[in-house]
Interface confidence: medium
């Protein structure tokens, strides 16, 4: 296994006061049983609201590297391949669960954390505010 | 909290053979510190590739309720509000980590699981296969 400089403040697995602590088996089971899932791997380029992927790294988190979608344009790509500013490219956001080492550097103690990530972009009709 | 009938086969927290097991604190910390994140709440209706949200519930999973997007149309909505079948509405899929009670009904023993969810839809140019 891995040898980690252990934080002396690491909680004891048997500590009954460690709040709402559970045992979690890290052999991640993959429930994506559909043998032909429609992968979104190239949608970022083919979309009328295309996006780029930006890297966000945090060594104390699993997964340590999260690639976030950033819409390429304010508008959407029209049939001529030009940006139409009468429409808006907007990020679709989703909360995901990640694990954070807590206290930091403890090899077998984690905290669940929710973070909001942008998964991709979609093209929407803008909300127009009419001034009286 | 919820009272769950305890499975007599639940693993012992101190069992050193319980595979790749760590302690996880379930007091979920929310890192979405932006007090007004641009939520995608109404994008499902305003998108050129609109979607409906379907509820998926599983009491043995955390989170137990997951909302799944299903694209409303095969094509995309054009400027006239009609469906244009020269373009495709496609789901943007994302894997999320969830916790599954394992063995079932054990209150403090979980397994990490990856599941694929559709978060929303985007409008893409179709891939055209030319037959020789």
């Amino acid at each position: 296994g891995i040898t980690i400089p252990r934080n002396p403040g690491c909680p004891n697995s048997e500590d009954k006061n460690f709040p709402r602590t559970v045992m979690v088996n890290l052999n991640i089971h993959n429930r994506n049983t559909n043998t032909n899932p429609k992968r979104s791997s190239d949608y970022y380029n083919r979309s009328t609201s295309p996006w780029n992927l930006h890297r966000n790294e945090d060594p104390e988190r699993y997964p340590s590297v999260i690639w976030e979608a950033k819409c390429r344009h304010l508008g959407c790509i029209n049939a001529d391949g030009n940006v139409d500013y009468h429409m808006n490219s907007v990020p679709i956001q989703q909360e995901i669960l990640v694990l954070r080492r807590e206290p930091p550097h403890c090899p077998n103690s984690f905290r669940l954390e929710k973070i909001l990530v942008s998964v991709g972009c979609t093209c929407v009709t803008p909300i127009v505010h009419h001034v009286a | 909290g919820i009272t769950i009938p305890r499975n007599p086969g639940c693993p012992n927290s101190e069992d050193k053979n319980f595979p790749r097991t760590v302690m996880v604190n379930l007091n979920i910390h929310n890192r979405n510190t932006n007090t007004n994140p641009k939520r995608s709440s109404d994008y499902y209706n305003r998108s050129t590739s609109p979607w409906n949200l379907h509820r998926n519930e599983d009491p043995e999973r955390y989170p137990s309720v997951i909302w799944e997007a299903k694209c409303r149309h095969l094509g995309c909505i054009n400027a006239d509000g009609n469906v244009d079948y020269h373009m495709n509405s496609v789901p943007i899929q994302q894997e999320i980590l969830v916790l599954r009670r394992e063995p079932p009904h054990c209150p403090n023993s979980f397994r990490l699981e990856k599941i694929l969810v559709s978060v929303g839809c985007t409008c893409v140019t179709p891939i055209v296969h030319h037959v020789a």
Partner: antibody, heavy 126, light 107 residues
Framework: EVQLVQSGAEVKKPGESLKISCKAS????????ISWVRQAPGQGLEWMGG????????DYAQKFQGRVTITADESTTTAYMELSGLTSDDTAVYYC???????????????????WGQGTTVTVSS | EIVLTQSPDFQSVTPKEKVTITCRAS??????LHWYQQKPGQSPKLLIK???HSISGVPSRFSGSGSGTDFTLTINGLEAEDAGTYYC?????????FGPGTKVDIK
């Protein structure tokens, strides 16, 4: 700049054990895993196993199960691969490769090997 | 385990020519397919990750496409320095596996 520096060439006898080190620099050690890949003379690449530093968890190819042990020391940012019960079939170049723990385009951990060590030549001969 | 097959095994190409290498997986692997280049006496080098994503520092003449079971690596305008062996690699499922390699040499 990311670098993986492996220990030097080894000559072993059948039945002996081998331990190769892989020292990582230029990146956060626990943000990545290390996989070990070998290449027999004139042959292709063969994945042996890997370690996810974040969890300290290991995975091994069935072919090497029971014979290979992969460990890591976070304090020295070094990973190790130990292979026991050597035979002449284990003559190969052994590489370590860095494996990101990534959430990429909506998916967890379908990982590429983004940086490789220079390789350690191992000869097993009586 | 997932078996990857590559074609061709060997290709002799003139500089500036277009090179296409294919990789087929024995089962669906989504886009968890990566391409490496290995020059004689050197370590492998990552060229393309997740089927089609380019790597910073890798020349733009290298591109990848495909998903599911069929993947392609394209070198648009081969250069002399591109001689070597190209491997595809799947990480959809343990054990991770590599294709047998395609050797490219310069005429």
């Amino acid at each position: 700049e990311v670098q993986l520096v492996q220990s030097g060439a080894e000559v072993k006898k059948p039945g002996e054990s081998l331990k190769i080190s892989c020292k990582a620099s230029g990146g956060s050690f626990i943000s990545y895993g290390i996989s070990w890949v070998r290449q027999a003379p004139g042959q292709g690449l063969e994945w042996m196993g890997g370690i996810t530093h974040f969890f300290g968890s290991t995975d091994y190819a069935q072919k090497f199960q029971g014979r290979v042990t992969i460990t890591a020391d976070e304090s020295t940012t070094t990973a190790y691969m130990e292979l026991s019960g050597l035979t002449s079939d284990d003559t190969a170049v052994y590489y370590c490769a860095r494996v990101p723990n990534e959430f990429w385009n909506g998916y967890y951990a379908t990982q590429d090997f983004d940086y490789w060590g220079q390789g350690t030549t191992v000869t097993v001969s009586s | 385990e997932i078996v990857l097959t590559q074609s061709p095994d060997f290709q002799s190409v003139t500089p500036k020519e277009k090179v296409t290498i294919t990789c087929r997986a024995s089962q669906e692997i989504g886009f968890a397919l990566h391409w490496y280049q290995q020059k004689p006496g050197q370590s492998p080098k990552l060229l393309i990750k997740y089927a089609s994503h380019s790597i910073s520092g890798v020349p733009s003449r290298f591109s990848g496409s495909g998903s599911g079971t069929d993947f392609t690596l394209t070198i648009n305008g081969l250069e002399a320095e591109d001689a070597g062996t190209y491997y595809c690699h799947q990480t959809e499922e343990l054990p991770y596996t590599f294709g047998p390699g395609t050797k490219v040499d310069i005429k």
